[in-house]
Interface confidence: low
């Protein structure tokens, strides 16, 4: 439905809080760089303008896109040759592409200062002072850090927020009411970030059809009372909604998530059980539910998969005449009955069906060339349940600490050219999901699992991308979504591989170490741990284990001393020396 | 966009008769088994009937067994019921669906057998 001002029209769909925050989220996303202040100035005058084409749809400039009114606004800023180098270049191109280039230089890991949190009772004044600025301060630091971050959610996020705030900066003890809320909130929008960059990968390196492909099936998990038919106006609407966001479209994508949560809860009788208490909340908290619903428990008496996918003689003729309709329920039949399955072996099975058909449809006898085809989903099927079998035995031996270590060495091994603070990173999130996944009975842990590594595996790729140095790691992330991991999974220890010279600089500690939280003296810990697999990657567990003992017994040695720095100069230097001797460096 | 619309419902007597329709739209109509499924007031959905994509194969709940028949016209991208010898119980919504799916997204015709 075609809106004179689509300005107006987003406006007036959104309400004026939503729209201001929307907009801050999109120039934000889009200029990492520039001041807060800077961003609430142009939010302000958008916002203006925007009033104006409320109130006359006709008025100037206001049947102009979206993309054209906030990429103008963009291009005024007066520093961004000098902040933003080769970026001020796409303000000479026309719509669409300006958007497209300015898409194309959002960085994930941009070099931003970490965000350190403030004294609870500074945090407090903060928000009573000025709640609105406080909370556009909180979106503002969020989108600059996480430009893919899902919007509509983020409001959500800060709405949790504000709650934590006005809940806590009452209470009698602040610190224990806010501290673990913020936490809360700092994990899971990490793990929110990271969900929606696969999606926006998805749809932006393999195209709209890999996307829906991924939501047929997560959605006939989710809703296996849902009707092919039903499941199939979910993922158009959902990849609308998506291809939005990762457009940068921010306006439009949360109009239209709101729009398909009122459709899904107006249908939820067609199309879950389990939407019920979802359905009754607020929108910002009602959207956030249902991406988060349990599956509904599976229809009893659905036949047999082989009599419409194998055993039927009209198999060809179907697949030939609407090949996606067919493999879409295909997709849809199989992930209904398999809770228990990763979404990416769902669609593993799916493509080694399709693969099956391409090639037998052609054959003398395609019956009896296909007649086989479940029997090919064996060994998919065993491959991920064996490694989660394995790793989690070694999760629960190990411990997460000692369990990331082992996955940091896996990983150094395999692709040791990547910086070290990337393999730190992807394999702490990677050793997680030993804590995440490991505990759920057997039918969960798959899905748990794979679908979790499928998402850090995807931050190594982005990562990766901005500074690419490893074939391996582009290889693994290009040639199929479907099967990075096993990718990955299947890499040896790199024998091309040059070790990296020593540099006792690398080894120096300092006391400050004895005052960071546990977390942080774990990373300083596993970046050594790195650094000395990419120094000896022929070094065996043994060895570096032996080594990493030595070392945790040296800071706490250190951290226990009078004189902290004296201890750490000399005794590290012993350590360093030791170390060079155990592993022959 | 996949569509399913149903038409044909109203109200009969008992031992009256009625032919459903279902038009679709969006997908290849003739490469999908499609069924009927019916929904009587404060009950969950029961299955009534199944046709394969040829129209060769038919399948009937026992309480219509008989009575109603199912056939489809692939050139026409669409699906019938004949409805015999209604009975009272025989009230409900009808709806169509692609498979074997007793879930419900259209909005289904309205069927009242009474006297």
């Known amino acids: 439905d075609a809106h004179k001002s689509e300005v107006a029209h987003r406006f007036k769909d959104l309400g004026e809080e939503n729209f201001k925050a929307l907009v801050l989220i999109a120039f934000a996303q889009y200029l990492q760089q520039c001041p807060f202040e800077d961003h609430v100035k142009l939010v302000n005058e958008v916002t203006e303008f925007a009033k104006t084409c409320v109130a006359d749809e006709s008025a100037e400039n206001c049947d102009k896109s979206l993309h054209t009114l906030f990429g103008d606004k963009l291009c005024t800023v007066a520093t961004l040759r000098e902040t933003y180098g080769e970026m001020a270049d796409c303000c000479a191109k026309q719509e669409p592409e300006r958007n497209e280039c300015f898409l194309q230089h959002k960085d994930d890991n941009p070099n931003l200062p970490r965000l350190v949190r403030p004294e609870v009772d500074v945090m407090c004044t903060a928000f009573h002072d000025n709640e609105e600025t406080f909370l556009k301060k909180y979106l503002y630091e969020i989108a600059r850090r996480h430009p893919y971050f899902y919007a509509p959610e983020l409001l959500f996020f800060a709405k949790r927020y504000k709650a934590a705030f006005t809940e806590c900066c009452q209470a009698a003890d602040k610190a224990a009411c806010l501290l673990p809320k913020l936490d809360e909130l700092r994990d899971e929008g990490k793990a929110s970030s990271a969900k929606q960059r696969l999606k926006c990968a998805s749809l932006q390196k393999f195209g709209e059809r890999a996307f829906k492909a991924w939501a047929v099936a997560r959605l006939s998990q989710r809703f296996p009372k849902a009707e092919f038919a039903e499941v199939s106006k979910l993922v158009t609407d959902l990849t609308k909604v998506h291809t939005e966001c990762c457009h940068g479209d921010l306006l439009e994508c949360a109009d239209d998530r709101a729009d398909l949560a009122k459709y899904i809860c107006e249908n939820q009788d067609s199309i879950s059980s389990k939407l019920k208490e979802c359905c009754e909340k607020p929108l910002l908290e009602k959207s956030h539910c249902i991406a988060e619903v349990e599956n509904d428990e599976m229809p009893a008496d659905l036949p047999s998969l082989a009599a419409d996918f194998v055993e039927s003689k009209d198999v060809c003729k179907n697949y030939a005449e609407a090949k996606d309709v067919f493999l879409g329920m295909f997709l849809y039949e199989y992930a209904r009955r398999h809770p228990d399955y990763s979404v990416v072996l769902l669609l593993r099975l799916a493509k080694t069906y399709e693969t099956t058909l391409e090639k037998c449809c052609a054959a003398a006898d395609p019956h009896e060339c296909y007649a086989k085809v479940f029997d090919e989903f064996k060994p998919l099927v065993e491959e991920p349940q064996n490694l989660i079998k394995q790793n989690c035995e070694l999760f629960e031996q190990l411990g997460e600490y000692k369990f990331q270590n082992a996955l940091l060495v896996r990983y150094t091994k395999k692709v040791p050219q990547v910086s070290t603070p990337t393999l730190v990173e992807v394999s702490r999130n990677l050793g997680k999901v030993g804590s995440k996944c490991c505990k759920h009975p057997e039918a969960k842990r798959m899905p748990c699992a794979e679908d979790y590594l499928s998402v850090v595996l995807n931050q190594l790729c982005v990562l990766h991308e901005k500074t690419p140095v490893s074939d391996r790691v582009t290889k693994c992330c290009t040639e199929s979504l479907v099967n990075r991991r096993p990718c990955f999974s299947a890499l040896e220890v790199d024998e091309t591989y040059v070790p990296k010279e020593f540099n006792a600089e690398t080894f120096t500690f300092h006391a400050d170490i004895c005052t960071l939280s546990e977390k942080e003296r774990q990373i300083k810990k596993q970046t050594a741990l790195v650094e000395l697999v990419k120094h000896k990657p022929k070094a065996t567990k043994e060895q570096l284990k032996a080594v990493m003992d030595d070392f945790a017994a040296f800071v706490e040695k250190c951290c226990k001393a009078d004189d902290k720095e004296t201890c750490f100069a000399e005794e590290g230097k012993k350590l360093v020396a030791a170390s060079q001797a155990a592993l022959g460096l | 966009e996949v569509q399913l619309v149903e038409s044909g419902g109203g109200l009969v007597q008992p031992g009256g008769s009625l032919r459903l329709s279902c038009a679709a739209s969006?997908?290849?109509?003739?490469?999908?088994?499609m069924s009927w499924v019916r929904q009587a007031p404060g009950k969950g959905p029961e299955w009534v009937s199944a046709?394969?994509?040829?129209?060769?194969?038919?399948r009937y709940a026992e309480s219509v067994k008989g009575r109603f028949t199912i056939s489809r016209d692939n050139a026409k991208k669409t699906l019938y019921l004949q409805m015999n010898s209604l009975k009272p119980e025989d009230t409900a919504v009808y709806y169509c669906?692609?498979?074997?799916?007793?879930?419900?997204r259209n909005q289904g015709t309205q069927v009242t057998v009474a006297s």
């Open positions: 669906t692609i498979g074997r799916s007793t879930s419900r």
């Open positions: 969006g997908f290849t109509f003739g490469s999908f088994g």
């Open positions: 046709i394969d994509s040829s129209g060769a194969d038919t």
